[in-house]
């Protein structure tokens, strides 16, 4: 009995035409939503003039349907037992699951003004940029609609810059009609314990963003893991959103629509400083903002974002050091709402439910040559938005899963 089930599982989780796994892998049967909460700045003038604490108020959720497009350019390589693909990006606004419309306005950090002196540190260039910031009537903060902020807008200051740069700015610009990848993953045909593990990303085994082993692409994309998952296992996965590989550890056993699943959670240890977790030393790439690598809970992903000062954290700076959250008022970190988890069915290794939570922040520093920033007395890691990307197996699929997998084992 058990041997037969094991044999069936091993056959059905292989990523090749005709298997259960392949069908769901090409196009997920799960509806995936991405909810956004925008941090609306309440005291922009006070911050710009007096370097006060930034008072924020989150507004949301604004919900989009994502990951509804099938993988493309799927190519099997029988030689090395891999399958390569790209994942197209798309987002459809869901008004019924949102508190407002895509035209709702927010006061947020001016992304271009904050990033410009960080990218162009030469004093002369900054003087030039300052004259253009003034000419375009730009300042430290700006008012933008949700649609503009997320998906892109033509920036008035950047439009005047006489350098060959992109003048469109947006937290996720460009997104629609783009693809993530190429991913090349093991199909598991020769070794089921390697199924879905990423062999390379964008043609490389390393990211070129981090020094040492931090640069490695480890594990799967978190949609599934090799079967027969044990509680003691650390689940490793790569997330292109945060430009790094990360891991989850067993948290609890839960019942999902009658299916026993293991909830794996991202531990606080993954966001710790090298002082608390020496393994993280290679994720600390600069010494000033990180207070000589003692700060924790924020990840500088600038190298992965063309040098822009982008920092990733958990929502509301959950698991971040006090120095990071101190200059921001209005944050309320909460483990249940703001942590990331994966509910993995242990026999198949399929992720049947997940909640990916992350926050996008921008570093803004005093810049003596930029009038809009010259009154700042300290750097701020400014929260722009946080997101909750969730997916749960549908009722129908869950029933099917129970009869075909868990039911047979019982």
């Amino acid at each position: 009995g058990d041997m037969l089930i094991e044999k069936t599982i091993k056959r059905e989780v292989v990523l090749e035409e005709g298997t259960t796994a392949f069908k769901n892998w090409v196009k997920t049967g799960t509806t995936v939503y991405r909810q956004f909460w925008i941090f609306d700045v309440q005291n922009p003038d006070d911050v710009a003039k007096n370097s006060s604490k930034i008072k924020v108020k989150q507004r949301g959720p604004y919900t989009y349907r994502v990951r509804y497009l099938a993988k493309e350019n799927i190519t099997q390589d029988p030689e090395d037992h891999t399958v390569s693909f790209v994942q197209p990006n798309g987002a459809i606004f869901e008004p019924s699951l949102s508190v407002g419309t895509e035209d709702d306005n927010f006061t947020v950090l001016n992304l271009a003004v904050a990033a410009a002196p960080h990218i162009y540190q030469n004093s002369f260039v900054q003087v030039v940029l300052n004259s253009l910031i003034k000419k375009s009537k730009s300042s430290m903060f700006q008012t933008r609609s949700l649609k503009e902020l997320l998906w892109g807008y033509k920036d008035p200051f950047l439009s005047l810059v006489p350098y060959p740069i992109s003048t469109t700015v947006g937290v996720f610009y460009p997104y629609n009609d783009t693809v993530d990848g190429v991913y090349k993953v093991f199909n598991g045909k020769d070794n089921i314990s390697k199924v879905a593990i990423i062999e390379s990303y964008k043609g490389k085994r390393n990211l070129s963003y981090w020094p040492s082993y931090c640069d490695m692409i480890n594990g799967t994309d978190a949609a599934s893991f090799p079967p027969f998952v044990e509680k003691s296992r650390t689940l490793r996965f790569f997330s292109s959103d945060i430009c790094r590989s990360i891991y989850a550890v067993f948290g609890s056993e839960i019942d999902l629509k009658g299916i026993p699943v293991y909830r794996f959670v991202l531990p606080a240890n993954a966001f710790a400083s090298p002082l608390q977790n020496p393994d993280n030393h290679c994720f600390c790439t600069e010494k000033v903002i990180s207070n000589n690598c003692t700060s924790y809970g924020v990840l500088d992903i600038g190298k992965c974002k063309e040098g822009k000062p982008v920092y990733i954290s958990l929502p509301h700076f959950l698991h971040a050091s006090p120095d990071v959250s101190e200059p921001i008022e209005g944050l309320h970190p909460n483990e249940d709402e703001h942590r990331t988890y994966l509910d993995v069915e242990p026999i198949t290794g399929f992720t049947l439910q997940f909640a990916k939570r992350l926050q996008v922040n921008i570093l803004v520093k005093p810049a003596r040559k930029i009038e809009a920033l010259k009154n700042l007395k300290r750097p701020y890691i400014v929260p722009i938005l946080w997101l909750n990307e969730t997916g749960t197996i549908g009722d129908e699929k869950a029933e099917m899963f129970k009869t075909q997998v868990t039911g047979k084992i019982k």
Epitope: N122, S123, V125, V127, Y163, R368
Partner: antibody
Framework: QVQMKESGAELVRPGASVKLSCKAL????????IQWVKQTPVHGLEWIGG????????VYNQKFKGKATLTADKSSSTAYMELSSLTSEDSAVYYC?????????????WGQGSLVTVSA | ETTVTQSPASLSMAIGEKVTIRCITS??????MNWYQQKPGEPPKLLIS???TLRPGVPSRFSSSGYGTDFVFTIENMLSEDVADYYC?????????FGSGTKLEIK
């Protein structure tokens, strides 16, 4: 050490153009801006404009827009300034200079100057 | 455009005396003022950069002060080698503008 080597003196006819060169030595050309300064007994020192070869950024003093054109050739680490439609008002010593880049040291290194004389 | 008014136009001082040159700007430029020395037949030389910063290798008898719109350049004990023209430059905003210069001579 850092050096800015400028082209020699020029005697040019009114209405003609002249192209001055400035070869940068002893540093990475794309890391620092090169600025041009005009000096005459009457007007003293006047900033013409600057070019940052690394970002391809060029900015002019409005007064010299249309008169001066700044370019840079990364392969030879040389900056150029072309002056057009010359008149006697353009007779001056022209300097190319390099700043400190990041430390607020403006015009820290100077070339020896190119004397341009406009005369019929 | 920020106008820089430099005074005096010329100055005749005895060796060992204290020399003071002043530049006033038409707009607030924080401490973005620079000071240059130019000897005959030579290009100007940067002595003091933004933030009243004495450049490496420049003797400590040279100093500057000021913030906003009013700036002063000082030579504590004038030496014969200090005979030159002196210029201030504001680097706060474009276009960069120089003062008209001060000719320093020996009395």
């Amino acid at each position: 050490q850092v050096q800015m080597k400028e082209s020699g003196a020029e005697l040019v006819r009114p209405g003609a153009s002249v192209k001055l060169s400035c070869k940068a030595l002893g540093y990475t050309f794309t890391d620092y801006e090169i600025q041009w300064v005009k000096q005459t007994p009457v007007h003293g020192l006047e900033w013409i404009g600057g070019i940052h070869p690394g970002s391809s950024g060029i900015v002019y003093n409005q007064k010299f827009k249309g008169k001066a054109t700044l370019t840079a050739d990364k392969s030879s680490s040389t900056a150029y300034m072309e002056l057009s439609s010359l008149t006697s008002e353009d007779s001056a010593v022209y300097y190319c200079t390099r700043g400190g880049g990041y430390d607020g040291a403006w015009f820290a290194y100077w070339g020896q100057g190119s004397l341009v004389t406009v005369s019929a | 455009e920020t106008t820089v008014t430099q005074s005096p136009a010329s100055l005749s001082m005895a060796i060992g005396e204290k020399v003071t040159i002043r530049c006033i700007t038409s707009t607030d430029i924080d401490d973005d003022m620079n000071w240059y020395q130019q000897k005959p037949g030579e290009p100007p030389k940067l002595l003091i950069s933004e933030g009243n910063t004495l450049r490496p290798g420049v003797p400590s008898r040279f100093s500057s002060s000021g913030y906003g719109t009013d700036f002063v350049f000082t030579i504590e004990n004038m030496l014969s080698e200090d005979v030159a023209d002196y210029y201030c430059l504001q680097s706060d905003n474009l276009p960069f503008t120089f003062g008209s210069g001060t000719k320093l001579e020996i009395k």
